[in-house]
């Protein structure tokens, strides 16, 4: 799998985009995972509806959500309030029991917002029970990892 | 119709290859997953794997994986089964299946081949 | 990999009986990915039930599944001549999709 990355700025949304072939995967739930280290293990953040007819709909977990469209073929997942912290390497999956697909891999770059001059102290946090229903997206960036990059720094 | 149609029965000695088919037709072949499936003389049915001839994606059964070779050639709506070394004991009915989409994400095989008997002995 | 257990090996009931037969899994498995096969002598298995209790096409209404989790049941509400055979279930959560041993339902 090549891996595709996303850049957001600082503080707004951004919007990842997991395209897949929907007959072979129907059926199927999703979800959106955290790889741990080059070679550890993906944890998962957030997935998708347990009944697969309702896939359409928004889940959340924190400032992430999920949702899929299961005839168009194309996961979707949210991550609001962008935060340093949340660059990295994520993976879109298509599950199978205890088994997973990778459907895309993801390589999350979180720039500064060059408006922004407050202190990391003054960021805001969502709070449990905030709504993001309605959260503006920003237009997200992405490319594909030329061959040879690789998303993790080197290990000394 | 929709229907799966299976190549003819074979009989063959330890240690030759083979390879059975399995075309499918009245579906769009390339989306939809194709099983194998043994079943050996007063048994009862064992899954050996799957292809979707979409992008030829293979799973196999542990029991199977080494021992058989699934693949599919989609410009002629054709799935294979095949062995590089038989042994008696591959002796058996093989079906192919067609993993069916449901209304609700729901699937199950619901289109089988009438079934290719393979039998090995010296 | 799930095994699927099938219960009883052998079941002898007289036509115009309910039959009963049960299907366990090694562990969980989404009702939506648990199917029920008839098979008859020297024929292809056909499909029965997918999603645990939905009828597939062409299926009389006499059978019906039901079940979730690691427990599922297909039942023959009254035994029709045609329904004396072979029945297997089958999970297609997660590979391998592995079937049960099978039930045969004969006559009494």
């Known amino acids: 799998h090549n891996t595709t990355v996303f850049q957001g700025v600082a503080g707004q949304s951004l919007q990842v985009s997991c395209p897949y072939d929907s007959m072979k995967h129907w059926g199927r739930r999703k979800a959106w995972c955290r790889q741990l280290g080059e070679k550890g293990p993906c944890q998962r953040v957030v997935s998708t509806h347990n009944l697969w007819l309702l896939s359409f709909l928004r889940r959340w977990n924190g400032s992430t959500a999920i949702t899929d469209d299961t005839l168009g073929g194309t996961l979707t997942i949210t991550l609001r309030n962008l935060q340093p912290h949340d660059a990295g390497l994520y993976q879109c999956q298509s599950l199978h029991g205890s088994e997973a697909d990778t459907l895309r891999k993801v390589l999350v770059e979180v720039l500064a917002d060059p408006l922004d001059h407050r202190d990391a102290g003054d960021l805001w946090f969502p709070g449990e029970s905030e709504s993001f229903e309605d959260a503006h997206v920003e237009h997200s960036i992405s490319r594909s990892l030329l061959e040879g990059e690789i998303p993790f720094p080197p290990t000394s | 119709e929709v229907q799966l149609v299976q190549s003819g029965a074979e009989v063959k000695k330890p240690g030759e290859s083979l390879k059975i088919s399995c075309k499918g037709s009245g579906y769009s072949f390339t989306t939809y997953w194709i099983g194998w499936v043994r079943q050996m003389p007063g048994k009862g049915l064992e899954w050996m794997g799957i292809i979707y001839p979409g992008d030829s994606d293979t799973r196999y059964s542990p029991s199977f994986q080494g021992q058989v070779t699934i693949s599919a050639d989609k410009s002629i709506s054709t799935a294979y089964l095949q062995w590089s070394s038989l042994k008696a004991s591959d002796t058996a009915m093989y079906y192919c299946a067609r993993a069916g989409h449901y209304d609700g994400g729901h699937l199950g095989m619901d289109v089988w081949g009438q079934g290719t008997t393979v039998t090995v002995s010296s | 990999e799930i095994v699927m257990t099938q219960s009883p090996g052998t079941l002898s009931l007289s036509p115009g009986e309910r039959a009963t037969l049960s299907c366990r899994a090694s562990?969980?498995?989404?009702?939506?990915?648990l199917a029920w096969y008839q098979q008859k002598p020297g024929q292809a298995p056909r499909l029965l039930i997918y999603g645990a209790s939905n009828r597939a096409t062409g299926i009389p209404d006499r059978f019906s599944g039901s079940g979730s989790g690691t427990d599922f049941t297909l039942t023959i509400s009254r035994l029709e001549p045609e329904d004396f055979a072979v029945y297997y279930c089958q999970q297609d959560d997660s590979a391998p999709y592995t079937f049960g041993g099978g039930t045969k339902v004969e006559i009494k």
């Open positions: 562990q969980s498995v989404s009702s939506s990915y």
